[in-house]
Interface confidence: medium
Amino acid sequence: AGVFELQIHSFGPGPGPGAPRSPCSARGPCRLFFRVCLKPGLSEEAAESPCALGAALSARGPVYTEQPEAPAPDLPLPNGLLQVPFRDAWPGTFSLIIETWREELGDQIGGPAWSLLARVTRRRRLAAGGPWARDIQRAGAWELRFSYRARCELLAVGTACTRLCRPRSAPSRCGPGLRPCAPLEDECEAPPVCRAGCSLEHGFCEQPGECRCLEGWTGPLCTVPASTSSCLGLRGPSSATTGCLVPGPGPCDGNPCANGGSCSETPGSFECTCPRGFYGLRCEVSGVTCADGPCFNGGLCVGGADPDSAYICHCPPGFQGSNCEKRVDRCSLQPCRNGGLCLDLGHALRCRCRAGFAGPRCEHNLDDCAGRACANGGTCVEGGGAHRCSCALGFGGRDCRERADPCAARPCAHGGRCYAHFSGLVCACAPGYMGSRCEFPVHPDGVSALPAAPPGLRPGDPQRYL
């Protein structure tokens, strides 16, 4: 179990000529809202296929009225995250669809009018529990900037949120603050609790008590923009006073990056991340067009012929950055399972597996299910050095020898009645509720022809699940 979270940072006209001035039609003011749809796997699916991993709508954004002669701004956005809960394992590979919708307010008579302004579809690999991934995408004449992550909830842990850690009444052999993990009784996992005050937006941690910063942020709590600080890079718990891993003057002191570039330390040197339109060791080269060949590593340059117009580099797989100058660390997503060693060969990823494991991602345990039998039609599932039985309906226990009641956990919400069924459990919902677990109200209160937020939301609520 867990939650996929999407944060929209900005939505506005893209660079270059022909960009729209306003999202609204000539009929008057409008407001924006976003829809996120998650589908499993990396295959191209029809737009009409269901969002099998889940979907969510944002609240409506503030009303936008175009100001004549004013520069086209980033548009006012809805507050809060879009959150899509997932009940089962996080698949790791998924298709992310973000739609930007316009709700027209010019005609107050009758029902609302919605138009799809932009749709972004990205096929992604993402491990649960990792830091925020950032992205910038063009959709027609619009540009969307967003971040996303998947995180486990309740007692689930691991990159797929499939391993359950449950506290035991027996005293743990693990150290303080650690909890025993099932089904591996001897393995202990610490839920990483970041350093107090660590920025939720710009920081993350992999070990308890640390605060590591996303690119462009620094300081002990990742609250200082990198370009204004003399202490940059990933921050560990080494120094309680400064948060700096390297004491004393560093290569980024005084910020050697020109034109708003942000500096990050590298071993014995520094690296500048340049804003669009600038490049060079210190972001000192400006007035760049595609004719100057600013896109490295085979990146495709798109831009106007006018010297003042911006350019955009479309990077090939494995590279990123405004000029495709950075190699993507594909091993940072920890694709190799069961302790396998990740090797990025450039053209491909390779996993070197520990003894007893095999497969492209070391996902197969060679001896888990050998000679093991699961009773009553159960199936043996490999994983983690100890076999596990996936039991048929009505049975449970380590080897599926115990009778189990699928309704025992009271899975039906809002007073729904649970019935055991040959293919699963069935919820008979109380009046006013629907869904496979009676989780959705049939008719949310307080809706009107032009709601200030999607039905069932009050202003300030972050999102509505679909």
Epitope: R35, C37, A47, E48, P50, C51, A55, L57, I109, G110, G111, P112, A113, W114, S115, L116, F440, P441, V442, H443, P444, V447, P454, P455, G456, L466
Partner: nanobody
Framework: QVHLVESGGGSVQAGGSLRLSCAAS?????MGWFRQAPQKEREWVAT???????????YYVDSVKGRFAISQDNAKNTVYLQMNSLKPEDTAVYVC????????????????????WGQGTQVTVSS
Amino acid sequence: QVHLVESGGGSVQAGGSLRLSCAASGYTYFMGWFRQAPQKEREWVATIGTGDIFNGAAYYVDSVKGRFAISQDNAKNTVYLQMNSLKPEDTAVYVCAAVQSKSSNYVLRDASTYNYWGQGTQVTVSS
């Protein structure tokens, strides 16, 4: 192809209630109700999102807000219009409509948005 079947119409005194049902034979994105009174133009009444885009989002024409409630049963592919505090001016043939095509524009009050229509059911409110 989506087939729509309405039921639940009838005669009622002013202030009374009726519940209309519309069952769809296939997947839809929106389902709604229009009405047409004698010598009047067809009027949009209410619509609810039934597909995964705006699932459960309900919208109404101003004149019925607070009196009518549209709801759905996804398992049965059925939409209901609960009509309370009925007035003589609510007398009309009520027709169920559905949107099956994926679109980048949904203007719910426009009949042209809807691809499929039912036969209609008569609602008569006497004073």
